[in-house]
């Protein structure tokens, strides 16, 4: 007996025994009613899920913030939060992330967000800029649609001092109902709902309550979500008595909320730990739960119904759950504007002393080599440029989205992803010398397929089973164009089966398309310069040393032959030893790229967020005048468009960064044809960032 206990102890302490994995999701409840529903949830799930499936345990805490702390401390696993609290959950030391989103509307067209709106009575005759002195109805203090968004947007219009915020809001409106506010310290916030009760006992609490506050004539404006009006007024004639206030100082009918809202707000979201957060288990649990107890599924227990209250555990208006892409952190999920609004509310920034000084541009550098060049640029720029590092291009794009970085230059394939993620192109790399380089954006460069002249039987039509070399997955010349053409031919995405092996940095590590790569250890097949076969030069090197075909740009071969690249692998190469594959099945010499290419590719472009566009544009134009191709001696001076290890930060053949004129969106910049081609290839996309961004903006 003693022996058995000892053995169990060893198992418990060292975790050495093959224990059954813990498949319990500890759900956090914030009230007696929620705890009751949670227990019912637990019991009903037990009755329908096999014993080896996910199960529910219930943990009761006093508040959502206590739940957030409990999850961070591994005392609970999941809770559903309003968007405002998702931000709190994200902040250190909590570090939680969104894992499952509630959706509204139909399964075919699921809405994972709602619109925060300002509703008024049709005959009230005031506009957004006349809200001061009006009476306001809020869903609750600190809630997204009812408080954070409207007050975040109005923040700089509030009377000074703006701290405490409740006092400033109380002085801005002539009276309010803001449930959950401190009625003792801020009686004006409770003027329209004595006591400011923080539950449904207060008739003006929550979405329906705030709307009732307006409907009863207590308030002049209600800050709610777009569906509140429809949920509370079934009759169109009744709805027609109300309008929405738009940010442009106009009004619109309530059904035009897509063109007249304060913000687009992510829906109620389940959060979990970023590390070891059981996100797959939580999804498995909720997915099974919605199958058995979702909308119109069961009489005995309903996930989206609260007989003992309202919105218990989940919103009563929810129709189901969607898995949040694993790539998404809270900042990305909430969106840059929403996060900025909350941050502004908390940090209290306003243009009191208007300034147009551009803050330093934070450039995103990939891996070690780019960071070294960026740091050199930063020193030479005397503080105009700062550097931020990331391991992959997608990590950089994510950092630009959430404000940790501001800009970087991207291949067209990544301009597409960045565009889908809400970034904008601001300047284009230009590769042709001309008198007016900065004003003359080019049509693009050519994507080509290069082979060794000695492999004389190789053509575009018999590439199956050959060894391929790519700049990286998701890049234009190295992936999107050749794989897009290939997809049209083979009608499937199993490119790793089409080629016998290859190097396509960014592929799954166990893929045959990582087999030819040369990076050591963890750097093998990584989409950055730590992988020797990454980028244009890397893909060409891969062809020289191991491959049958390289997908690169038309300048790659001349740039690395005839002694132009002094590296040992390249110094003795001759351009005449290579040929191009043409789409008609013929081959041509390298210099005949204009008549033998796969497609024209858009030039690389600098991308940024909309709000940084002007500063990035201005500072980069200054920087290229100082360090651009006008600098003749790069041995003693910093040169922006030169690299030790090829194409660092910008392509080395960049002559200047050119204005885009009217090609100032990613669609216009890339062109309809290319956008369509990449769109088709999205079926094959392994981009977790693209998945995450199209989750917010389909």
């Amino acid at each position: 007996m003693r022996l058995a206990v000892g053995a169990l102890l060893v198992c418990a302490v060292l975790g050495l025994c093959l224990a059954v994995p813990d498949k319990t999701v500890r759900w956090c409840a914030v009230s007696e009613h929620e705890a009751t529903k949670c227990q019912s949830f637990r019991d009903h799930m037990k009755s329908v899920i096999p014993s080896d499936g996910p199960s529910v345990a219930c943990v009761k805490k006093a508040s959502y913030l206590d739940c957030i702390r409990a999850i961070a401390a591994n005392e609970a696993d999941a809770v559903t939060l309003d968007a405002g609290l998702v931000y709190d959950a994200y902040l250190a030391p909590n570090n939680l992330k969104p894992v499952v989103a509630e959706f509204y509307g139909s399964k075919e067209d699921p809405q994972t967000f709602y619109y925060a709106v300002a509703v008024v009575k049709k005959d009230s005759g005031f506009q957004m800029n006349q809200l001061r002195g009006k009476k306001s109805c809020h869903t609750g203090l600190g809630r997204s649609a009812g408080w954070n968004i409207p007050i975040g947007l109005l923040y700089c219009d509030l009377p000074e001092p703006r701290k405490p915020l409740e006092k400033a809001v109380a002085n801005f409106f002539s009276g309010s109902c803001a449930p959950c506010a401190d009625g003792t310290d801020f009686p004006q916030l409770c003027q329209l709902c004595p006591g400011c009760g923080c539950s449904t006992l207060n008739q003006y609490f929550g979405y329906s309550g705030a709307f009732k506050c307006l409907k009863d004539g207590a308030g002049d404006v209600a800050f709610v979500k777009h569906s509140t009006i429809f949920e509370n007024l079934a009759n169109k004639a009744d709805r027609d008595q109300y309008e929405l206030l738009c940010l442009d100082n106009t009004r619109k009918p309530v059904d035009e909320y897509k063109d007249c809202h304060l913000a687009q707000v992510p829906s109620h979201t389940v959060v979990a730990r970023s590390m070891g957060g059981k996100e797959d288990l939580i999804w498995e649990l909720l997915n099974q739960a919605q199958e058995h107890f979702g909308k119109d599924k069961s009489k005995e227990f309903q996930l989206f119904s609260s007989p003992h209250g309202k919105d218990l555990l989940f919103k009563d208006s929810a129709h189901g759950f969607l898995k949040v892409p694993p790539r998404m952190d809270a900042k990305m999920y909430l969106g840059y504007e929403y996060v900025t609004a909350i941050r502004n509310l908390r940090e209290g920034t306003c243009p009191e002393a208007p300034t147009d000084e551009c803050k330093p541009v934070k450039w995103c550098a990939l891996s070690h080599h780019e960071r070294l060049k960026c740091d050199e640029w930063s020193v030479n720029s005397v503080g105009k440029i700062e550097c931020v590092s990331a391991e992959t291009t997608e990590d950089c794009i994510a950092k630009i989205m959430n404000g940790e970085a501001d800009a970087m230059s991207l291949d067209g394939g990544f301009v597409y992803i960045a565009g889908k993620c809400g970034l904008v192109p601001v300047l284009a790399e230009n590769y042709n010398k001309s008198d007016n380089c900065e004003d003359t954006p080019e049509a693009g460069y050519f994507a080509i397929a290069v082979v060794k002249k000695s492999a004389s039987d190789l053509t575009w039509d018999n590439l199956k089973g050959k060894k391929s070399c790519h700049t990286a997955v998701g890049r234009t010349a190295g992936w999107n164009i050749p794989m897009g053409l290939l997809y049209n031919k083979i009608n499937h995405c199993r490119f790793d089966e089409f080629f016998s092996e290859g190097c396509a940095p960014g592929s799954k590590k166990d893929s045959s398309l990582c087999k030819l790569c040369m990076g050591s250890g963890l750097n093998l097949c990584e989409p950055n310069n730590k992988e020797g076969y990454y980028g244009y030069t890397g893909a060409f090197r891969c062809l020289v040393e191991k491959g049958d075909v390289a997908f690169v740009k038309h300048q790659t071969v001349p740039q690395n032959t005839g002694g132009k690249n002094p590296d040992p692998w390249a110094k003795n190469l001759n351009e005449k030893d290579y040929e191009l594959l043409c789409l008609d099945g013929t081959r041509k010499p390298v210099e005949e790229y204009a008549n033998c290419h796969l497609a024209r590719a858009p030039n690389h472009a600098v991308v940024t967020r909309k709000d940084k566009e002007a500063c990035v544009h201005k500072i980069l134009r200054q920087q290229q005048h100082l360090f651009g191709s006008n600098v003749t001696d790069c041995s003693g001076n910093f040169c922006l468009f030169r690299s030790e290890t090829k194409d660092l930060l910008f392509r080395d053949d960049t002559v200047c960064l050119a204005k885009l004129h009217d090609r100032n969106t990613y669609e216009k910049y890339l062109g309809e044809e290319y956008v369509k081609a990449v769109g088709n290839l999205r079926k094959c996309s392994t981009s977790s960032l693209l998945e995450a961004c199209t989750f917010r903006r389909p």
């Epitope: 800029n129 947007l153 700089c156 100082n249 306003c350 904008v424 566009e613 002007a614 969106t665």
Partner: nanobody, 125 residues
Framework: DVQLVESGGGSVQAGGSLRLSCTAS????????MAWFRQAAGKQREWVSW???????GYADSVKGRFTISRDNAKNTLYLDMTSLKPEDTAMYYC???????????????????WGQGTQVTVSS
């Protein structure tokens, strides 16, 4: 750096006119929403007018019919033509830009991310 510089302010009698200009240097503002705000001494800054890239405009009720906003994208310049001026129009006038693609405009201060230093307009009775 990127700058918005207002000019054209001054003193004028009630009923008179003024034209304010705001020149943007360092960037073409064709995709920004541009606006004028004003702040009277001891008062809160208030929105006056906005103009979208496509030329659509919006005005506060207090200036409707008297003020006209316009922009010349080729010259990177925003204008505010003020007629039938009243003593209550006395204020510091600020030019502001919001980078949102230029397809939508706002009346709220917090949505504008670039501001000029202002030009004073004084209307005496």
């Amino acid at each position: 750096d990127v700058q918005l510089v207002e000019s054209g302010g001054g003193s004028v009698q009630a009923g008179g006119s003024l034209r304010l200009s705001c020149t943007a240097s360092g960037y073409t503002y064709s995709r920004a929403c541009m606006a004028w705000f004003r702040q009277a001494a001891g008062k809160q800054r208030e929105w006056v007018s906005w103009i979208i890239a496509d030329g659509s405009t919006g005005y506060a009720d207090s200036v409707k019919g008297r003020f006209t906003i316009s922009r010349d994208n080729a010259k990177n310049t925003l204008y505010l033509d003020m007629t039938s001026l009243k003593p209550e129009d006395t204020a510091m006038y600020y030019c502001a830009a919001a980078y949102n693609g230029g397809d939508r405009c706002y009346t709220l201060i917090g949505l504008y991310n670039h501001w000029g230093q202002g030009t004073q307009v004084t209307v005496s009775s």
